[in-house]
């Protein structure tokens, strides 16, 4: 189970993980105390038949070719959490692990 | 965490789970002993901003809008295994649980 890593200038056409730094301050998300920025990454690229397919199911749907199935797309296949300090809706400061905030691997599903 | 369920006649445009029965015999996959057919389901539909987004990360990437990011797509967000009886490459009969063979829920990621 592997995935490609690319940089933002790469001409790679296949499904790949690209670097992306999310800046909460730039978004105006002032309820987030820390971190102000973090490396989130994102997935982009084409999912040609079979390349980087995460599940056998993806292959089976392609073979069955039901109406409306758009083929696999490039999406996170492994994600990890980050620890965050933030205000909740009641203006209380919360420290917690927020799941699925960082893309570790991309694939076709 | 929920997902829409549709049938094959539905006019729903959003990301939805549709029924699909995979027929191994019809595919000519004669190394599979049992089951000969199973309900696999598949995901199809549009991922308008925010609808059925599985991760906060999806929202953040949309907001950052990096070059080449194609927006979220409709993909399995929960899958389950099935038990299968099949011949492996050495012609041995194997009984095992094959992961991610059934789509239980669809979402946008």
């Amino acid at each position: 189970d592997f995935g490609l890593d690319c940089d933002e200038h790469s001409t790679e056409s296949r499904c790949c993980r690209y670097p992306l730094t999310v800046d909460f301050e730039a978004f105006g998300w002032d309820w987030i105390i820390a971190p102000k920025r973090y490396k989130a990454n994102y997935c982009s690229g084409e999912c040609e038949f079979v390349f980087l397919q995460k599940y056998p199911h993806t292959h089976l749907v392609h073979q069955a070719n039901p109406r409306g199935s758009a083929g696999p797309c490039c999406t996170p296949t492994k994600m990890s959490p980050i620890n965050m300090l933030y205000f909740n809706g009641k203006e209380q400061i919360i420290y917690g692990k927020i799941p699925a905030m960082v893309v570790d691997r991309c694939g076709c599903s | 965490d929920f997902g829409l369920d549709c049938d094959e006649h539905s006019t729903e445009s959003r990301c939805c789970r549709y029924p699909l029965t995979v027929d191994f015999e019809a595919f000519g996959w004669d190394w599979i002993i049992a089951p000969k057919r199973y309900k696999a389901n598949y995901c199809s539909g549009e991922c308008e901003f925010v609808f059925l987004q599985k991760y906060p990360h999806t929202h953040l990437v949309h907001q950052a809008n990096p070059r080449g990011s194609a927006g979220p797509c409709c993909t399995p967000t929960k899958m389950s295994p099935i038990n299968m009886l099949y011949f492996n490459g050495k012609e041995q009969i194997i009984y095992g649980k094959i992961p991610a063979m059934v789509v239980d829920r669809c979402g946008c990621s």
């Epitope: 790469s10 001409t11 790679e12 690229g45 084409e46 | 194609a70």
Partner: antibody
Framework: EVQLLESGGGLVQPGESLRLSCAAS????????MNWVRQAPGKGLEWVST????????YYADSVKGRFTISRDNSKNTLYLQMNSLRAEDTAVYFC???????????????WGQGTLVTVSS | EIVMTQSPATLSVSPGERATLSCRAS??????LAWNKQKPGQAPRLLIY???TRATGVPARFSASGSGTDFALTINSLQSEDFAVYYC?????????FGGGTKVEIK
């Protein structure tokens, strides 16, 4: 035989718009990324834009970003370049070029059209 | 942006002789380099891709080599139809960039 035929060029004034077309034949159009490359009179080649086979991925040169829009109609085997806010420096022969798919990188052109001349002048 | 620099700008060669054209990238482009040939009033034509692979229908007298940042195109025993402008082009990074061209003219 692969054929690419550009059309839509002509003389326009600065600030005006023009839409170029490239009619493709001889290959499965939807399976290949397509490109526009231009050449100013007496000058070298300059890449303008690339669009993936599905149309889902699009890339532009900084010099045209925000003014030019690449698109494709796979049902008509046609590539387009909508050029707005044209400037004198956009004067060039515009070639459409097919991506080769010799490897997984965009931008390797194996067939080129003959080009269409765009002149921007007052 | 990766800058592609070709040298010489003009190369004067007699028919039947060998011509060697140089192309240098300002940063590593791996093997994602192509060579195109263009005659006056015509469209470019792909000669070489992936640094050294000849495109379909390209004669064996054309060969190319290099890696990373330094590349070369060699034309053995120049024929009359080989007198043209040659462009190198990298397709490793956006934006795609071409060299300024080398004009191969009859000596």
């Amino acid at each position: 035989e692969v054929q690419l035929l550009e059309s839509g060029g002509g003389l326009v004034q600065p600030g005006e718009s023009l839409r170029l077309s490239c009619a493709a034949s001889g290959f499965t159009f939807s399976s290949y990324a397509m490109n526009w490359v231009r050449q100013a009179p007496g000058k070298g080649l300059e890449w303008v834009s690339t669009i993936s086979g599905s149309g889902g991925y699009i890339y532009y040169a900084d010099s045209v970003k925000g003014r030019f829009t690449i698109s494709r109609d796979n049902s008509k085997n046609t590539l387009y370049l909508q050029m707005n806010s044209l400037r004198a420096e956009d004067t060039a022969v515009y070639f459409c070029a097919k991506d080769s798919r010799y490897n997984w990188n965009y931008g390797n052109f194996d067939y080129w059209g003959q080009g269409t001349l765009v002149t921007v002048s007052s | 942006e990766i800058v592609m620099t070709q040298s010489p700008a003009t190369l004067s060669v007699s028919p039947g002789e060998r011509a060697t054209l140089s192309c240098r990238a300002s940063q590593n482009v791996s093997s994602n380099l192509a060579w195109n040939k263009q005659k006056p009033g015509q469209a470019p034509r792909l000669l070489i891709y992936a640094t050294s692979t000849r495109a379909t229908g390209v004669p064996a007298r054309f060969s190319a080599s290099g890696s990373g940042t330094d590349f070369a195109l060699t034309i053995n025993s120049l024929q009359s139809e080989d007198f043209a402008v040659y462009y190198c082009q990298q397709y490793n990074n956006w934006p795609l960039t071409f060299g300024g061209g080398t004009k191969v003219e009859i000596k």
